[in-house]
């Protein structure tokens, strides 16, 4: 045959499916690799073949089609399973071609188990929610083209093991989950259970994400610089180990990049030629605000780094702020035999 | 199509009880809330209370708890609400109301008018 | 006394534009979506607006919602004689325990 376009193994889709449950995949040529649709490719006179690899074998096979109930099928881009079996588990691989083109993906197929509490090895979503806020609502995910618009299914929530049937701050409203107001108390798992008809059978499909209530964009202030502050001064004598941290408080802020870093006379530490170390460390509190820590550390301070200044920095996307460590050489104590003996005019 | 059918007008003496009930066709019965709304003559329309077909939790207005009673019946997908203690000011027409709690109530009963008077 | 306060009326001619204002607070409009309902005389109210600005299939586009802050608004434009009715705000509050709250509606009158 022909040579392939081989794209390879697309590990970046790691698919994971729910055993016994329907589950539609599309093709991932027509979504990241080709620059045109399925239907333009099959206008184009381009057959789409697919066949896959069992787990722990490297041999590749046909799909069988004509299995009782039409169990797998293929409609367009996307490989139907009506529902999963465990023995799915494998490297699935479309293939795009013509006499004269082809291009071909793999990517693997993961058919997981849950239990009767929806717990399983599936890599969960996470939905951050913020707390005290006003309605927030989660849409039950992925569920898309599995029935038409004509059907409709039974959706019920849980969260963990429980179903959500009280009118508390967590409403089931068909396919999303309200949250009136959340508390840190909801955080959690949460799994919509959607149930449809089809061909007379009952189908479902279980989706489950975790939720994580952090700040909110209410309560979100610029970073602030607990330390250095004025109440405390670094007095140091030559040869003595300087340490100043720098510790600051970031609100929690969707998508916002935080920053910590110390300057030395108005440069970064890296272009002043002192022997200066910098040790960071970073604390989340429940609502997943940000306390960084950056200690700079100068194992032997001379007494011309002991003049220098030395600032903290910090940015959010709230703004940007800055705090002058007081640093002062200690005035060596007076030795009594000679200082205070001429102190007190003795000769 | 979606309906919401109410008994019939209802006329009871001051401390009496009464029961609407609201006959649900036209969708899944267990997948939508119901809610009981009132409007006295003249009035806007007053709030009493929320019913879960699913699992039957409730949740009443403050000014109705301990007087109000919302049921339902899967078998024949009907809602029930019963008021209790009657008195001239709950003269009503009483709304059955299918919808979810954050988008709205989008089907309504025809309404039921109860009249208290003695 | 409602908790979300409406006029008590309003009024304007065919073909016009009329708006009708919903105030709340933060504990209800302010953190939540709003809904409006049409009430014509003798029949049930009918939902015009959900989530604040959102109409369900039916609902003209002569319909609209908004929201700013701890108010709401409907729009009605190009007005018509069959727009003659109550309309009520409506939202929630949760403090522990829910409750729906309604305007305590507002009366359009068409002129002419």
């Known amino acids: 045959s022909e040579r392939c376009d081989d794209w390879g193994l697309d590990t970046m889709r790691q698919i994971q499916v729910f055993e016994d449950e329907p589950a539609r995949i599309k093709c991932p040529l027509f979504e990241h690799f080709l620059k045109f649709n399925y239907s333009t490719a099959h206008s184009a006179g381009l057959t789409l073949i697919w066949y896959w690899t069992r787990q722990d074998r490297d041999l590749e096979e046909p799909i069988n089609f004509r299995l009782p109930e039409n169990r797998i099928s293929k409609e367009k881009d996307v490989l139907w399973f009506r529902p999963t079996l465990l023995n799915d588990t494998g490297n699935y691989t479309c293939m795009l071609r013509n006499t004269t083109y082809c291009s071909k993906v793999a990517f693997p197929l993961e058919v997981v188990q849950k239990d009767s509490c929806f717990n399983s090895p599936m890599k969960l979503p996470v939905h951050k929610l913020y707390i005290e806020y006003g309605i927030q609502r989660i849409t039950c995910p992925n569920v898309d083209g599995y029935f038409p618009s004509s059907v409709k299914p039974t959706i019920t929530w849980y969260m963990g093991c429980y179903k959500i049937q009280n009118f508390n701050n967590v409403i089931p409203e068909g396919m999303n989950l309200s949250f009136l107001i959340a508390f840190i108390s909801n955080n959690g798992n949460y799994t919509c259970v959607v149930t449809y008809p089809e061909n007379g059978r009952t189908f479902h499909l279980t989706r489950t994400l975790t939720v994580k209530v952090v700040g909110s964009p209410k309560n979100a202030v610029p970073p602030v610089i607990h330390s250095p502050n004025d109440h405390v001064v670094y007095e140091k004598e030559p040869g003595e180990e300087l340490l100043i941290p720098c510790t600051v408080y970031f609100s929690f802020l969707m998508d916002s990049r935080n920053e910590v870093w110390w300057t030395i006379d108005g440069k970064k530490p890296d272009d002043i030629p002192i022997d200066v170390t910098i040790n960071e460390s970073i604390s989340h509190s429940r609502t997943e605000d940000e306390t960084r820590t950056q200690i700079l550390s100068i194992k032997k301070v001379t007494s011309e780094d002991l003049k220098r200044s030395y600032v903290c920095h910090a940015r959010s996307a709230k703004g940007e702020v800055a705090k002058a460590a007081t640093v002062k050489q200690k005035v060596p104590a007076p030795r009594y035999t000679v200082e205070l003996a001429c102190g007190f005019g003795a000769t | 199509q979606v309906q919401l059918v109410q008994s019939g007008a209802e006329v009871k003496k001051p401390g009496a009880s009464v029961k609407v009930s609201c006959k649900a066709s036209?969708?899944?019965?267990?997948?939508?809330?119901m809610h009981w709304v009132r409007q006295a003559p003249g009035q806007g329309l007053e709030w009493m209370g929320i019913i879960n077909p699913s699992g039957g939790s409730t949740s009443y207005a403050q000014k109705f708890q301990g007087r109000v009673t919302m049921t339902r019946d899967t078998s024949t997908s009907t809602v029930y609400m019963e008021l209790s203690s009657l008195r001239s000011e709950d003269t009503a027409v009483y709304y059955c109301a299918r919808g979810f709690v954050t988008s709205g109530i989008d089907y309504w009963g025809q309404g039921t008018l109860v009249t208290v008077s003695s | 006394q409602s908790v979300l306060t409406q006029p008590p009326s309003v009024s304007a001619a065919p073909g016009q534009k009329v708006t009708i204002s919903c105030s709340g607070s933060s504990s209800n409009i302010g953190n939540n979506y709003v809904s409006w309902y049409q009430q014509l005389p003798g029949t049930a109210p009918k939902l015009l607006i959900y989530?604040?600005?959102k109409r369900p299939s039916g609902i003209p586009d002569r319909f609209s919602g908004s929201k700013s802050g701890t108010s709401a608004t409907l729009g009605i434009t190009g007005l018509q004689t069959e727009d003659e009715a109550d309309y009520y705000c409506?939202?929630?509050?949760?403090?522990?325990?829910?409750?729906?709250?309604f305007g305590g509606g507002t009366k359009l009158t068409v002129l002419g």
């Open positions: 036209g969708y899944t019965f267990t997948s939508y809330y």
């Open positions: 989530d604040n600005n």
């Open positions: 409506q939202t929630w509050t949760y403090t522990g325990r829910l409750w729906i709250v």
